[in-house]
Amino acid sequence: RKIPKVGHTFFQKPESCPPVPEGSMKLDTGIINENQRVSMSRNIESRSTSPWNYTVTWDPNRYPSEVVQAQCKHLGCINAQGKEDISMNSVPIQQETLVLRRKHQGCSVSFQLEKVLVTVGCTCVTPVVHHVQ
Amino acid sequence: RKIPKVGHTFFQKPESCPPVPEGSMKLDTGIINENQRVSMSRNIESRSTSPWNYTVTWDPNRYPSEVVQAQCKHLGCINAQGKEDISMNSVPIQQETLVLRRKHQGCSVSFQLEKVLVTVGCTCVTPVVHHVQ
């Protein structure tokens, strides 16, 4: 899913207030819902009919530093006999997410949001058939 | 996938620099990669063997204001005949993502990152069989 562009009013103060300095805002360092629970089924990446592998990218100047990307293992899907069926398609499910980028200039540290496209997993679909002719 | 807790050093300046005021940092208002392209297949939510619906939540004090959540349509998966097969399971694929929360106190505006758990889509899996003793 695609994150829309940030509205120009999002970083502004209410109309009745003095304007904010252009270009930067105050970011509180805590994170809301930091202890939130992900309740994904066990090993769905290997049990799926469109299985996938994970690779991890690491960047110490990004939060989260670790971003995990899925790659579909097959072109087709795994059928009930455990064989690949290429009349179906394993396709990636992608999600735009935000990360926080840390920027250093000498002793000045600032932060900026960054959009990252994450492949979260794969699903098995009936392909769009463009009939021969 | 779960986002780890933010390390206590992430918001700190380099050791040789004077310490930063406790609790807040400078956030640049631009967004890196704002025009990034999501290349999801057409209508995969309806073409999947584990199809899903989308619902949208809206919050004007959050960026992105719109967060889309998927819900699997079925307990089972759709077979080659278009019928639900409950020997397989449609399961949600979840992803922890960050959003930016805007907080007002009078004319003071600050921002804080918030973790949100998003169900991005569904995949069809072989169920974990718990054998009857």
Partner: antibody, heavy 118, light 112 residues
Framework: QFQLVQSGAEVKKPGASVKVSCKAS????????LNWVRQAPGKGLEWMGV????????SYNQKFKDRVTMTVDTSTSTVYMELSSLRSEDTAVYYC???????????WGQGTLVTVSS | DIVMTQSPLSLSVTPGQPASISCRSS???????????LHWYLQKPGQPPQLLIY???NRFSGVPDRFSGSGSGTDFTLKISRVEAEDVGVYYC?????????FGQGTKLEIK
């Protein structure tokens, strides 16, 4: 008009690798799978594998699984087939072939002759 | 792997006469979705193969109606109602129901 244009003939030594390209035109490149099929001199057809140009996902014939790599460059509408650890029995014409799901291999490239000889 | 067996391996036909090629698969080619992914190709001398018939009996665009396909399960037939000189070459049956995709060994058609 649909076209699949392959790279030119190659002569390789045993143990080397070869990379054959196939440039597609005349249709929406990401809408169709592309297969690689080979034909040894005077012999029949042998399927090597298939790639989905949109995702780069592949399905390989187990016979070639450890030696073949299929890749895609969507910016140039080109797919590549690399075969490593070449032996004399890999001497063949290699075809890239468009594939419409479950229908059939409808359009074939002109073929690329790969000769493996010491 | 599915083995595709063609017969005869060669045939010589007088122009205007019919011809028939048989193809047998080692397993059923009926997919769980109900389709049968059995196809026929012709490779003319010095050319890449070309699609004639897809999914048992569907003629590809531009293929003359003297070519027809039939069969089900494991037994399939390609018929040419009246052979013409331009029909010479090697005919292959192929299946794409199961991975890996496989081809028959080919049937060489010559003109008498």
């Amino acid at each position: 008009q649909f076209q699949l244009v392959q790279s030119g003939a190659e002569v390789k030594k045993p143990g080397a690798s070869v990379k054959v390209s196939c440039k597609a035109s005349g249709y929406t490149f990401t809408d169709y799978n592309l297969n690689w099929v080979r034909q040894a001199p005077g012999k029949g057809l042998e399927w090597m594998g298939v790639i989905h140009p949109d995702y780069g996902t592949t399905s390989y014939n187990q016979k070639f699984k450890d030696r073949v790599t299929m890749t895609v460059d969507t910016s140039t509408s080109t797919v590549y087939m690399e075969l490593s650890s070449l032996r004399s029995e890999d001497t063949a014409v290699y075809y890239c072939v468009r594939y419409d799901y479950g229908d059939a291999m409808d359009y074939w490239g002109q073929g690329t002759l790969v000769t493996v000889s010491s | 792997d599915i083995v595709m067996t063609q017969s005869p391996l060669s045939l010589s036909v007088t122009p205007g006469q019919p011809a028939s090629i048989s193809c047998r698969s080692s397993q059923s080619l009926v997919h769980s979705n109900g389709n049968t992914y059995l196809h026929w190709y012709l490779q003319k001398p010095g050319q890449p193969p070309q699609l004639l018939i897809y999914k048992v009996s569907n003629r590809f665009s531009g293929v003359p109606d003297r070519f027809s396909g039939s069969g089900s399960g494991t037994d399939f037939t390609l018929k040419i109602s009246r052979v013409e000189a331009e029909d010479v070459g090697v005919y292959y049956c192929s299946q794409s129901t199961h991975v890996p995709l496989t081809f028959g060994q080919g049937t060489k058609l010559e003109i008498k």
